[in-house]
């Protein structure tokens, strides 16, 4: 396993709809053509896997159906964005790159982003 | 908006190094690729070097690539350029630039992919 550098901003603010976006790079050694991106999720000191996609370099990424998160990729980047987020999902999210074909393997982690989650304030009664 | 300022260029003898920074005001520098470009007496401004905004990713004119190192420092707002193995033909002025937009993936030697740039500062090789 050789390591690999990623990059990912370091905080995020995520809308009021709960939608956050951010951006994974990473630092491709060779001419990868099989890639894996997983969106790890910590908070306090417990790391949980959110999403992940493996691509062909060049296409779409593709989620499972029921996954909160959707992305694209272009060269040595991908936009990735997730869904349904809400206040107790504030936390460090993390990227992982690993290049899975063909060989050797690299593996690359990103610092991670912190996503802030606010929730809406519900909108007040109306007499009208 | 964004000032570049460009420092460390000089006069040096061939085979000499040089080592020029770029320090950029505002709080986005993380999000935008980095350049440096050079324009020597009498001729077109040209790409020298570039570097990803998350620092990941270098890219290199051919005619600097193995002489000239790009980095950068997000903490510090900065964007440097080693020079080494400086030869008489690459005495002119350096620009730094800064990419036009956050988190591009549209990695280019382009002028027209960068928005802002610096005043430049002279470098001189001497043979």
């Known amino acids: 396993c050789k390591a690999m550098h990623v990059a990912q901003p370091a905080v995020v603010l995520a809308s009021s709809r709960g939608i956050a976006s951010f951006v994974c790079e990473y630092a491709s050694p060779g001419k990868a053509t099989e890639v894996r991106v997983t969106v790890l999720r910590q908070a306090d000191s417990q790391v949980t896997e959110v999403c992940a996609a493996t691509y062909m370099m060049g296409n779409e990424l593709t989620f499972l159906d029921d996954s909160i998160c959707t992305g694209t990729s272009s060269g040595n980047q991908v936009n990735l964005t997730i869904q349904g987020l809400r206040a107790m999902d504030t936390g460090l999210y993390i990227c992982k790159v690993e290049l899975m074909y063909p060989p050797p393997y690299y593996l690359g982690i990103g610092n991670g982003t912190q996503i802030y989650v606010i929730d809406p304030e519900p909108c007040p009664d109306s007499d009208f | 908006e964004v000032q570049l300022v460009e420092s460390g260029g000089g006069l040096v003898q061939a085979g000499g190094s040089l080592r020029l920074s770029c320090l950029a005001s505002g709080r986005t520098f993380s999000s935008y690729d980095m350049g440096w470009f050079r324009q020597a007496p009498g001729k077109e401004r040209e790409f020298v070097a570039a570097?990803?905004?998350?620092?990941?990713?270098?890219y290199y004119a051919d005619s600097v690539k193995g002489r000239f190192t790009i980095s950068r420092d997000n903490a510090k707002n900065t964007v440097y350029l080693q020079m080494n193995s400086l030869k008489p033909e690459d005495t002119a002025v350096y620009y730094c630039?800064?990419?036009?937009?956050?988190?591009?993936?549209?990695?280019?030697?382009?002028?027209?992919?960068?928005?802002?740039w610096g005043q430049g500062t002279q470098v001189t090789v001497s043979s």
């Open positions: 630039a800064r990419g036009s937009a956050p988190y591009s993936s549209s990695r280019s030697s382009a002028q027209e992919t960068y928005a802002q």
């Open positions: 570097i990803s905004w998350g620092g990941v990713n270098t």
